[in-house]
């Protein structure tokens, strides 16, 4: 069966790690050094990706799979397959064309990447601000002001503290 199929399309028999070599009457040839083919039936092997500069090697290239890169410390991946490395900033900052800049008042960023986002507007949900926001953290919304009116609280008030030196009556 294999021989019959190979007479129809000899390249279809070439497994991953090889290519269909036109210079050799279309026989399957192993990929040359530093190249790969991850699927069968390929007419060429692809050159291995090299992780250089700000990229570092996460997985070495083999004859059947490409190298995989990530970014050196202080940078993070962007794009499919980590096609770019972008500089990290500190929490509370965002990356601009001029470098890392602090988040403007009313915005925050809790990661080393991405942009500063506006604090949550608690009043839109009818709630109040329980904890103020910072450059690094969003605000924490609490119960609505109505929930804080006397008698509306579901929280049991703490027992009054006993005075020292007195035993219970």
């Amino acid at each position: 069966f294999e021989r019959t199929r190979s007479l129809q399309d000899p390249c279809s028999n070439c497994p991953a790690g090889t290519f269909c070599d036109n210079n050799r009457n279309q026989i399957c040839s192993p990929c040359p050094p530093n190249s790969f083919s991850s699927a069968g039936g390929q007419r060429t092997c692809d050159i291995c990706r090299q992780c250089k500069g700000v990229f570092r090697t996460r997985k070495e290239c083999s004859s059947t799979s490409n190298a995989e890169c990530d970014c050196t410390p202080g940078f993070h991946c962007l794009g499919a397959g980590c096609s770019m490395c972008e500089q990290d900033c500190k929490q509370g900052q965002e990356l601009t064309k001029k470098g890392c800049k602090d988040c403007c008042f009313g915005t925050f960023n809790d990661q080393k990447r991405g942009i500063c986002r506006p604090w949550t507007n608690c009043s839109l949900d009818g709630k109040s601000v329980l904890v103020n926001g910072t450059k690094e953290r969003d605000v924490v919304c609490g119960p609505s002001p109505a929930d804080l009116s006397p008698g509306a609280s579901s929280v049991t008030p703490p027992a009054p503290a006993r005075e020292p030196g007195h035993s219970p009556q």
Epitope: P30, C31, P32, P33, E60, S62, S63
Partner: nanobody
């Protein structure tokens, strides 16, 4: 250039075993990829097994589980151990690296 010389072929009964050898001489620094092929009369040369540039052994489906390829760098020799041989394994087997080919060794499986 690299010179390759195969040996170890012969006549064997179905189910038997053979070990082919491929001895290299010359500039063997280029021997990062080495492969065994087979060819019958009037047929296309077919890949059987190879050691890739990353030193991993690979096999075509018909050889998986029956054949084993490895190399002994001290002896500049690559081997193809062929087990559970079948009638359809009968062919001339060639060793190859880059543009260098051996002269071939005949393997005949017959009862």
């Amino acid at each position: 250039a690299v010179q390759l010389v195969e040996s170890g072929g012969g006549l064997v009964q179905p189910g038997g075993s053979l070990r082919l050898s491929c001895a290299a001489s010359g500039n063997i620094s280029s021997l990062r990829v080495i492969a065994w092929y087979r060819q019958g009369p009037g047929k296309q040369r077919e890949l059987v097994a190879w050691i890739a540039w990353d030193d991993i052994a690979h096999y075509v489906d018909s050889a998986k589980g029956r054949f084993a390829i490895w190399r002994d760098n001290t002896k500049k020799t690559t081997y193809l151990q062929m087990n559970s041989l079948k009638l359809e394994d009968t062919d001339v087997y060639y060793c190859n690296s880059g543009d260098s080919w051996g002269q071939g060794t005949q393997v005949t499986v017959s009862s």
